[in-house]
């Protein structure tokens, strides 16, 4: 039986925003923790495992040319990584040799829990969002962003770090999840798939979107990321799905048009400052929120994820540019850079709007299975 779709409103105008209803009619629900139709073949969404592409999914090989303090991680795993001895519970960084996050990658060895034990934690990201099961929390107010409209100067660093394309943000971009929940934006990066294959990290009722943007924020209670890691609410990520639309997205084009300059792993370029908020949906009032983790090693938990209900539209050409321009480690294309969805393990995803209500005429009575726990605390 099909789960109801997200509540359908007409998208708000302006900006780069797309559909307010991310699900198409063809999207079918799937069991939590079962393989997703769009996932790489053979992928089982097991805790702490990364995607394992099948043979046909291996990135194209690039012809040879001439030429990444003390971390405090909580909620560390009580499970044993397969084939590994039980890891200590209180140090994601055991020592420089034993816990080397420098050699992780998508789609293969080493298993991420060996790279960082926190990757086998119980409250990991990304997750599959099932609107019908989300808890409506009226206390979740519209997000507040301040200082996101940047002038052209100073320019910003856009870098291919081998795992994604990352834009480093200057000081002064302030974000509030609610009263007393204040953050500053540090960087944004993207996750994508490959030709004809979606690559968002989060999914909605098993549906994977073409791509996903993450804007990473640090709580104003901390001065450094490594101080905030593992602390509940220490980091917050705003996430939005990118979908194909009929028109070019001018905000994204300011970044996508520069990708050729940073095709090689490790390369970077300078881009004029831009309106960062234009890269996000225009509706800051409708979103899902849950506590999870970083989606790459060290997979530190305590991260507050806010996933917009509204999507952002890019043209087919832009999505192709995103997935087909950059090169990653080992002279392979930088593609399919998303982690498998992770089990909720009892977590309840909260919604700032009644997401479980089917707006179609068939719905006689709204059903909301989970109640709001402590929104706004």
């Amino acid at each position: 039986q099909r789960l109801p779709r997200m509540q359908e409103d007409s998208p708000l105008g302006g900006g780069s925003s797309g559909e307010d209803d991310p699900l198409g009619e063809e999207d079918l629900p799937s069991e939590e923790d079962s393989p997703r139709e769009e996932d790489p073949p053979g992928e089982e969404d097991l805790p702490g495992e990364e995607d394992l592409p099948g043979e046909e999914d291996l990135p194209e090989v690039k012809p040879k040319s001439e030429e990444e303090g003390s971390l405090k991680l909580e909620d560390l795993p009580t499970v044993e990584a397969p084939g590994d001895p039980q890891e200590p519970q209180n140090n994601a960084h055991r020592d420089k040799e034993g816990d080397d996050q420098s050699h992780w990658r998508y789609g293969g060895d080493p298993p991420w829990p060996r790279v960082s034990p926190a990757c086998a934690g119980r409250f990991q990201s990304p997750v599959d969002i099932r609107p019908q099961l989300a808890a409506f929390c009226p206390a979740l107010r519209p997000l507040e962003l301040l200082g996101f409209q940047l002038p052209p100067l100073p320019e910003l660093r856009l870098r291919n770090n081998g795992h994604s394309v990352q834009l480093t943000l200057p000081p002064g971009l302030e974000m509030a999840l609610g009263p007393g929940r204040e953050y500053r934006a540090l960087q944004l990066h993207l996750h994508w798939g490959a030709a004809g294959r979606p690559g968002s990290e989060h999914t909605v009722e098993g549906h994977r979107f073409p791509a996903e943007i993450h804007v990473v924020h640090l709580s104003t209670a901390f001065a450094r990321v490594d101080e905030a890691l593992g602390r509940p609410g220490g980091l917050a990520v705003l996430a939005a799905f990118l979908e194909e639309g009929p028109e070019e997205n001018s905000a994204y084009e300011q970044l996508l048009s520069r990708l050729e300059e940073i095709a090689e792993e490790g390369s970077e370029t300078q881009v004029p400052g831009l309106d960062i908020s234009a890269l996000l949906p225009s509706d800051f009032s409708r979103y899902f929120q849950y506590e999870g983790s970083l989606t790459t090693p060290p997979c530190a938990q305590g991260v507050i994820w806010t996933v917009f209900n509204q999507t952002v539209m890019l043209s087919a050409k832009q999505l192709h540019t995103l997935s087909d321009t950059l090169w990653g480690p080992g002279d392979s294309r930088l593609q399919l850079n998303f982690r498998a969805t992770q089990p909720l393990n009892g977590r309840v995803i909260e919604a700032s709007f009644p997401a479980g209500v089917d707006s179609s005429p068939r719905a006689a009575e709204p059903v909301q299975l989970n109640s709001c726990l402590a929104a706004g605390d």
Epitope: E68, G69, S70, L71, H93, K96, D100, Q101, S102, H103, W104, R105, R159, N161, G162, T168, L186, Q187, V216, L218, R224, V225, D226, E265, G266, L294, P298, G328, P329
Partner: nanobody, 115 residues
């Protein structure tokens, strides 16, 4: 307290060599992407080379074939081997460490290429 300390700069004749070092403390060095930048007289700070946490290296076109970037995680140290130096390589060379959203800079070491 995070510190990046560059060393190895100095005066060298055109065609000569220098090896810059950047020693990091207060960070878990192995997880950071490390880079070298330089500020030459009258110009903005520019990117020279980067080595990712995984070991992938990239050098900007003007130094390819002459410079080599490397790292020794056991010593928390980043290196830039500079050969066939030219007058236009003169400037202050800065070390950068970047990870997730943390971004740290050293104070710089001066390289002068002159006869």
């Amino acid at each position: 307290q995070v510190q990046l300390v560059e060393s190895g700069g100095g005066l060298v004749q055109p065609g000569g060599s220098l090896r810059l070092s950047c020693t990091a403390s207060g960070i878990i060095f192995s997880v950071y992407d490390m880079g070298w930048y330089r500020q030459t007289p009258g110009k903005q700070r520019e990117f020279v080379a980067r080595i990712t946490a995984g070991g992938g290296t990239y050098l900007t076109d003007s130094v390819k074939g002459r410079f080599t970037i490397s790292r020794d995680n056991s010593k928390n140290t980043l290196y830039l081997q500079m050969n066939s130096l030219r007058a236009e390589d003169t400037g202050v060379y800065y070390c950068n460490a970047a990870w997730i959203g943390d971004d740290y800079w050293g104070q710089g070491t001066l390289v002068t290429v002159s006869s």
